[in-house]
Amino acid sequence: IIDGAPCARGSHPWQVALLSGNQLHCGGVLVNERWVLTAAHCKMNEYTVHLGSDTLGDRRAQRIKASKSFRHPGYSTQTHVNDLMLVKLNSQARLSSMVKKVRLPSRCEPPGTTCTVSGWGTTTSPDVTFPSDLMCVDVKLISPQDCTKVYKDLLENSMLCAGIPDSKKNACNGDSGGPLVCRGTLQGLVSWGTFPCGQPNDPGVYTQVCKFTKWINDTMKKHR
């Protein structure tokens, strides 16, 4: 997260980290006791899922292995459209005050809505500095028309843009798959942005979760 600050303790109980061994790979969100939602570009063969603590490496955190993951069938490694994936935990997460399910959206929030993006990704770019504590930054949703003015043909349907004019505030490497939460519901998953991160007036691009609630629910049902 660029130009952010540590999240208020326990304010993101649905936030998870996907680890490769002990190393941060991506962010994600807990959908229910068995399922994590993340970005399709975060695909690995096996995951260790960190839940229940804002601090990576915290011994009190839950750590659950996951071996099965289901990318959206329309995901493209070329255009990064449909950049979402469900990861099935090998054992159930224990819900608590620090481990809660995210609220999936029942509607798409409009441009101008203030949202929070969070993650353990690098706080500097292009040189990397990985924080141990979960970082947050507030950004505003940007209309597809305004975002297309910036990214032209790089932008596809079901991609959502967010940022702050003339500001560096943005997600970055390591935040991928993590949540963009607006008015208490999950509206985006960190997908991509300009590198180095934090170029002023280059918004962050997110997978627009409100367009995929049916696929999310159908996929969890299908692979119960």
């Epitope: 910036v150 990214y151 032209k152 790089l154 997908s191 991509w192 590198f195 170029q199």
Partner: antibody, heavy 122, light 107 residues
Framework: QVQLQESGPGLVKPSQTLSLTCTVS??????????WNWIRQHPGKGLEWIGS???????YYNPSLKSRVTISVDTSKNQFSLKLSSVTAADTAVYYC??????????????WGQGTLVTVSS | DIQMTQSPSSLSASVGDRVTITCQAS??????LNWYQQKPGKAPKLLIY???NLETGVPSRFSGSGSGTDFTFTISSLQPEDIATYYC?????????FGGGTKVEIK
Amino acid sequence: QVQLQESGPGLVKPSQTLSLTCTVSGGSISSGGYSWNWIRQHPGKGLEWIGSIYRSGSTYYNPSLKSRVTISVDTSKNQFSLKLSSVTAADTAVYYCARAKQLTLTRYFDYWGQGTLVTVSS
Amino acid sequence: DIQMTQSPSSLSASVGDRVTITCQASQDIANYLNWYQQKPGKAPKLLIYDASNLETGVPSRFSGSGSGTDFTFTISSLQPEDIATYYCQQASQLPFTFGGGTKVEIK
């Protein structure tokens, strides 16, 4: 189809400043998600990235050349430029301008100019 | 800086042969690895990006694989027009760096 064209003097005297301009057509230099780069190739040798500039004006330089390099952009003319000061014979090379798709997920040089040979000699 | 070690520096093969070039990064670069073809007197041309994605319009006989530190570029059936120098390039960190190149010739 994006096209890039380098222009500038082919001969520069030692200790002077090498100046090149890259004119972009078929695409806007102010598009987000791309960087505009200078890369050079010494005669018979490999490729060396010199530096890049973004639509925002942010610049990034190779540390090995940083003290001598300035890259600037003129969005109104859809051009970007390279200045390399205090040149020596070791700066004799073919200089390429190139566009990079440069995202957190993917980064590569997709369009290149044809290159211009700059010789440093008195 | 990340060092890119490419091998071999040159090779000679017959038309129709399978040609393999390797590239090793001095540290983990995930899949931020690209391959370019350069013909004499011309600018480099992108063939493969993100280690394994074929650039639009590039023949399918070209392919790439690998992640982390070890990468491979393959021409499944060498054609006369493939005579060129091939470069790998890492895009994980600035400054972006290139391998030393592999010159491919026809026997």
